[in-house]
């Protein structure tokens, strides 16, 4: 986690819609071959749910060992269970692989809660419902972990899709996607469609149901509606973006835009919630409470600790506001907004022994490490991680949960000035000063 001193803040001017549409860098521009179109073999290759993560099937070693791997755009290590664990049905057995190479190096990854540690090596890796290629990739064989694997989640490892800068033990350990692009002709881009069910799934339903798609090397038109709008990747470590404005039911939160990105804003498929910096969270909750004031919910609900329930089929979606995040656009002084519904930020949870209720957790929570656009946001959209052009695209997902009155939206352009000032600059630690 990053900790920094607060810098003086400046405000970006709000987003008045332009009467005239700016040129969009979406369908009008020619693309490299293979970047767009249909990727039938990769559609529906994810399973899972927001609370426990979305996973893809991968094979490791020779002969291939099949494992389910969590898709995580918030980290950069490919790490798999490599020893028995009570929550794992199977694990990577290096001794059975003729192509395994030991790097004779350990790796230790602590989290706020929990950790994993393991041994580094390389092996041959492929994705059965992905591009028809095999790559030699770095693998962290997890030998010990605490609060990392999730009981009943059905995944046995994690695929960190972010950049080398945040790889452990250091940035010299090439992430999987970098290896894939280097060793094959797969374009340097992937896209994710995470599909929330809109209702709780039990374990067998998760196994039977489709959780979405990870399109490796391209964009599939069938997975979204409308246009793709792109925001620059501010820095290649996490998938860092800049939020320039936040609205609740069209009402501007009116905060200094630097607060929205303090100390960063990232797109992270491995996080369940929309996580917001403390000040922003408090302002957002205050606004959501006011908008939904026809019902009074307990404090524990807003803290994400308690469920609220309605008789099946009677959830009053209309009393909850939509939330819009304005993201920096690709053109100077231009932004666009993504809008999510309560169907995204109220997460369905199976309550103890009851199918006659629809129960939900509030899936917006407080963060001390900046904004995290987790599954709650991503489930509304088809998200394109265009690494080649250092940008992230958003379009309305063809599988997002909505009702007959409202739908998630991606709209623009809007005029927003001084957007660069919305980014927070994390103070760099000067190593030399630590030597005194």
């Amino acid at each position: 986690t990053q900790h920094g001193i607060r810098l003086p803040l400046r405000s970006g001017l709000g987003g008045a819609p332009l009467g005239l549409r700016l040129p969009r860098e979406t369908d009008e521009e020619p693309e490299e071959p293979g970047r767009r179109g249909s990727f039938v073999e990769m559609v529906d290759n994810l399973r899972g749910k927001s609370g426990q993560g979305y996973y893809v099937e991968m094979t490791v070693g020779s002969p291939p060992q099949t494992l389910n791997i969590l898709v995580d755009t918030g980290s950069s290590n490919f790490a798999v269970g490599a020893a028995p664990h009570p929550f794992l049905h199977r694990y990577y057995q290096r001794q059975l692989s003729s192509t395994y190479r030991d790097l004779r190096k350990g790796v230790y990854v602590p989290y706020t809660q929990g950790k994993w540690e393991g041994e580094l090596g390389t092996d041959l890796v492929s994705i059965p419902h992905g591009p028809n290629v095999t790559v030699r990739a770095n693998i962290a064989a997890i030998t010990e972990s605490d609060k990392f694997f999730i009981n009943g989640s059905n995944w046995e490892g994690i695929l960190g899709l972010a950049y080398a800068e945040i790889a452990r033990p250091d940035d010299s350990l090439e992430p999987f996607f970098d290896s894939l692009v280097k060793q094959t002709h797969v374009p340097n881009l992937f896209s994710l469609q995470l599909c929330g069910a809109g209702f709780p799934l039990n374990q067998s339903e998760v196994l039977a149901s489709v959780g979405g798609s990870m399109i490796i090397g391209g964009i599939d038109h069938s997975l979204y509606t409308g246009s793709l709008w792109y925001t620059p990747i501010r820095r290649e470590w996490y998938y860092e973006v800049i939020i320039v404005r936040v609205e609740i039911n069209g009402q501007d939160l009116k905060m200094d835009c630097k607060e929205y990105n303090y100390d960063k804003s990232i797109v992270d498929s491995g996080t369940t919630n929309l996580r917001l910096p403390k000040k922003v969270f408090e302002a957002a909750v205050k606004s959501i409470k006011a908008a939904s004031s026809t019902e009074k919910f307990p404090d524990g609900f807003w803290l994400g600790e308690q469920l609220v329930c309605w008789q099946a089929g009677t959830t009053p979606w209309n009393i909850f506001p939509v939330i819009s995040l304005y993201l920096m656009g690709e053109v100077t002084n231009q932004s666009f907004r993504i809008t999510i519904l309560p169907q995204q930020y109220l997460r369905p949870v199976e309550d103890v022994a009851t199918s006659q209720d629809d129960c939900y957790k509030f899936a917006i929570s407080q963060s001390s490490t900046g904004t995290v656009m987790g599954a709650v946001i991503m489930e509304g959209f088809y998200v394109v991680f265009d690494r080649a052009r250092k940008r992230i695209g958003f379009a309305v997902s063809a599988c997002h949960v909505h009702d007959e009155f409202r739908t998630a939206a991606v709209e623009g352009p809007f005029v927003t000035l001084d957007m660069e000032d919305c980014g927070y600059n994390i103070p760099q630690t000067d190593e030399s000063t630590l030597m005194t």
């Epitope: 600790e305 308690q306 309605w310």
Partner: nanobody, 129 residues
Framework: DVQLQESGGGSAQAGGSLRLSCEVS????????MGWFRQAPGEEREGVAA????????WYADSVKGRFTISHDNAESTVYLQMNSLQPEDTAIYFC??????????????????????WGQGTQVTVSS
């Protein structure tokens, strides 16, 4: 103030029956959520059954479905738990719990501890094989 008083606990043979009562005093009873919870030694307190005294809807833990029945008598301000086909694993202290109506269309998850404001002292149920 709200008081809950349980009664009807005791010993029973496996396969036998008991009827627990919870008398409510100190407030207008109608419209409240009422629940029965139990706690075995060294275990967490768990929800067994609940009732919405306004609409009459009921909820049961999977472990007691088909064996236990929750009901209420508005006139008597009392909630009952009829326990049939008792099993040794039903041995526990049984608590009655109540909560005010939330004042909206939503309600708290009926079999969760945190959903209730008021608790009785408990009554012991022992089932021997």
């Amino acid at each position: 103030d709200v008081q809950l008083q349980e009664s009807g606990g005791g010993s029973a043979q496996a396969g036998g029956s008991l009827r627990l009562s919870c008398e409510v005093s100190g407030y207008t009873y109608s419209g409240y959520f009422m629940g029965w919870f139990r706690q075995a030694p060294g275990e967490e307190r768990e929800g067994v059954a609940a009732i919405d005294t306004n609409g009459g809807r009921t909820w049961y833990a999977d472990s007691v479905k088909g064996r236990f029945t929750i009901s209420h008598d508005n006139a008597e301000s009392t909630v009952y738990l009829q326990m049939n086909s008792l099993q040794p694993e039903d041995t526990a202290i049984y608590f009655c719990a109540a909560r005010r109506p939330p004042g909206g269309s939503w309600y708290p998850p009926p079999l969760r501890k945190y959903s209730y404001n008021f608790w009785g002292q408990g009554t012991q149920v022992t089932v021997s094989s």
